[in-house]
Structures are given as C-alpha cells and as structure tokens.
Amino acid sequence: AAIGSCSKEYRVLLGQLQKQTDLMQDTSRLLDPYIRIQGLDVPKLREHCRERPGAFPSEETLRGLGRRGFLQTLNATLGCVLHRLADLEQRLPKAQDLERSGLNIEDLEKLQMARPNILGLRNNIYCMAQLLDNSDTAEPTKAGRGASQPPTPTPASDAFQRKLEGCRFLHGYHRFMHSVGRVFSKWGESPNRSRR
C-alpha cells in the first residue's frame, strides 16, 4: 500500500493513532454490523461469538514490548487482520442481494470501510516508527510474536461455522484494539520518554 505523507509532530501523530484505535475498538463499527448481516443476532448465538484464546497478542504481551517492538507487532497483526477481512468480505452479501433480503446497507458499508481504516492506521504506524527511528534515544527492539499465527479460520464444515469463526475473529480484533489503545494511552509526551 502506498504510504501517505507523515506528520513530523510526535504529539499529532500519537493523537491520530489514539483516535484511530478508539474507533477500531468500537464494536458498532464492525462486529455488530457483521452479526446483523450474518443473522447471528440471537442471544444463544452471541454466546458462541467469543474469541479463541491466543488468536491475538494479549495486553500483557503488548505492554512488555518496547515502543518499536510494539509498533512492529501491531503492524504485523494488522497485516494478518487485513488478510482475514478480505476473506470475510468475499462472503458478504453483494449490493444486489441487499434489497432482496432487507439487510441494512449501512451495516455492509461499515464492514467494507474496515480495511481502508486499517490501512490508514498502518500508515500512521509507519510514520510513528520513522519518527522513533529519528529520535535521539535508542531503545532495544523487543518484537513480540504478533498473533501466534495469522488468525486463520479453523476448517469449517459449513457456512454457518464460518460465520461463527468470523464473529469470534472480530470479537478478538476489537478486544485487541482496546488493548492497543490502552498501550498508546501510556506513551509519553515525546518520542524520548515513556510513561510506564
């Protein structure tokens, strides 16, 4: 993906990252529309929509990383998320199906905005990494494992299982972005200082 222009202002960049992660932990932007579109909006089914442990790095893991390592892990995990979202998008209803099924077009639009939004976040991650590389204080790069593997769907016997897998994945994604937001909130006022 093409990298957009980067702000040289650490505080501006951190503010943008915090704003983006705030939006991405909001389930009304991705998980909730997915649940409605896939017909999973039933209490019994919602219970099955819990992430599989280990699919995403934990908040504890993220907190243990240096800032560069954290950005690397975040970038790598979002790369996996992009692939998985592309796969989910293939299975979404097309515009032609909407009127025939009465589905909310707003829900479908929210789902299709997820990938562009993540690309925007990754652009700012790249910019922040550049900024940290140019700051005078070196910090050991302690990269995390990222998601243990790209969060891959378990072999699904049918479409319904795939829908549940997608639901669990998105649940985990929102939880992960919540953790990311909490880590960013602890970052210091300058690229040289970190509040622990």
Epitope: R36, D41, A95, L98, E99, S101, G102, L103, N104, I105, L108, E109, Q112, M113, P116
Partner: antibody
Framework: EVQLQESGGGLVQPKGSLKLSCAAS????????MNWVRQAPGKGLEWVAR??????????YYADSVKDRFTISRDDSQSMLYLQMNNLKTEDTAMYYC????????WGQGTLVTVSA | DIVLTQSPASLAVSLGQRATISCRAS??????????LHWYQQKPGQPPKLLIY???NLESGVPARFSGSGSGTDFTLNIHPVEEEDAATYYC?????????FGGGTKLEIK
C-alpha cells in the same frame, strides 16, 4: 410474489384525520424497513415517512412537511404498515404509496387522499 | 436537505437514438463504498418502476438499454436505443441521508 396493497384513502376535510393501511405479502415483512411515498396530482414524488425493522428498534423518520402530524407504524404479526395522518392540510392531497427498503423496487398501486373543504 | 436537480425537464428523442438525463445533487450522495442514487420510470396512472439502484446497478427485469453512471454530485441515466415504450417521466432519488428526496422529473417523448 411481492405484493403491497394500500387502503384507507378518501375525502377528508382540512384538520381532519385518516389512517392508511398497507397489506404486505410475498416476503418476510418483519426484516424490512418500510416507507410511505406520496405524489400530489400532476406533481413529483415525495418521501413521507420510514420505519425500520425490530432489529433497529422500529426507529421512525419523517419528512419535515409531515412531522408531528403523521405517525408511521407497523404490525409485523399481520404484515401491515400504517400511516396515521392528523391535522390534514390541503397540500397533503396526493396518491400515497407503500414501498419497501432504501430504493423502491416494489410499489403498491397507491391510495388517493383528498383534503378539501 | 439534499436537493436533486434533473435536466432537462423534458426531451424528445427519435426512436433508436440515445436519451441522456442528468441528475445533480446539492451535495455528495456518495461514500467511498456506494453511490446512493437511484432511477425510476413512471407512466401515467401507474406507480413508479425502479430502473437503476446505487447509480449503476440494473434492476432485475429492466432492459439492458437502460444504464446509469456517476458519483458524488453528478449522475446520468442513459437509454439507448430508445424504444416507443420508453415514453415516460423519469425520476432520480437519493438515499444518502434522511430526508430522502427525489428530482423534479424529466419527461421523455419519443419522436
């Protein structure tokens, strides 16, 4: 086959009331957002009101020209859509159509409302 | 409210030729995903009939001589080749935000 059948139109005096009904069949009514659209004689089309489905908490929306006078409602168990019209004005004279979704692939034949002294 | 302005108000086109109707919105009716603009045909004494939805999607059962294009604020309905039965009034409608509005209509006459 999708069918929408409006009824309840007629002649009413200004400031009077009327309740329009729309019987829906041939589709799963309760999953759809439904709308009323009207057309004054010899004029263009005007969206009037919208009601969403249960999953969207039956949210309702109105054109400014009918706000606080008209009420859209639905009965999913009977696959019925309603438009309660109060404090009618001469400019409410129109053919009223019941239509489904955000773009209107299915229309009823309409019911004519005439507001006149 | 978003105002949709159609032009021309009326036009006469010879059988087999192309009819082009424009719909201009007072502000964008598009997002990065969809163009929320739809086209209808109405004949006297009948309810309107959906031709095109989301700017360019042909409704099922509508002849392929109808096509729609455009994004943002400028949209076009093309009919080619025009046939006798296409004599009607054509309306655009947006569903970008409430209140939804219609254009004023374009009356097509076949010469």
């Amino acid at each position: 086959e999708v069918q929408l059948q409006e009824s309840g139109g007629g002649l009413v005096q200004p400031k009077g009331s009327l309740k329009l009904s729309c019987a829906a069949s041939g589709f799963t009514f309760n999953t759809y957002a439904m709308n009323w659209v009207r057309q004054a004689p010899g004029k263009g089309l005007e969206w009037v009101a919208r009601i969403r489905s249960k999953s969207d908490n039956y949210a309702t929306y109105y054109a400014d020209s009918v706000k606080d006078r008209f009420t859209i409602s639905r009965d999913d168990s009977q696959s019925m859509l309603y438009l309660q019209m109060n404090n009618l004005k001469t400019e409410d004279t129109a053919m009223y159509y019941c239509v489904r979704y955000d773009w209107f692939a299915y229309w009823g034949q309409g019911t004519l409302v005439t507001v006149s002294a | 409210d978003i105002v949709l302005t159609q032009s021309p108000a009326s036009l006469a086109v010879s059988l087999g030729q192309r009819a082009t109707i424009s719909c201009r919105a007072s502000k964008s009716v598009s997002t990065s995903v969809y163009n929320y603009l739809h086209w209808y045909q109405q004949k006297p004494g009948q309810p309107p009939k959906l031709l095109i939805y989301l700017a360019s999607n042909l409704e099922s059962g509508v002849p392929a001589r109808f096509s729609g294009s455009g994004s943002g604020t400028d949209f076009t309905l093309n009919i080619h080749p025009v046939e006798e039965e296409d004599a009607a009034t054509y309306y655009c409608q947006h569903s970008r935000e409430l209140p939804w509005t219609f254009g004023g209509g374009t009356k097509l006459e076949i010469k």
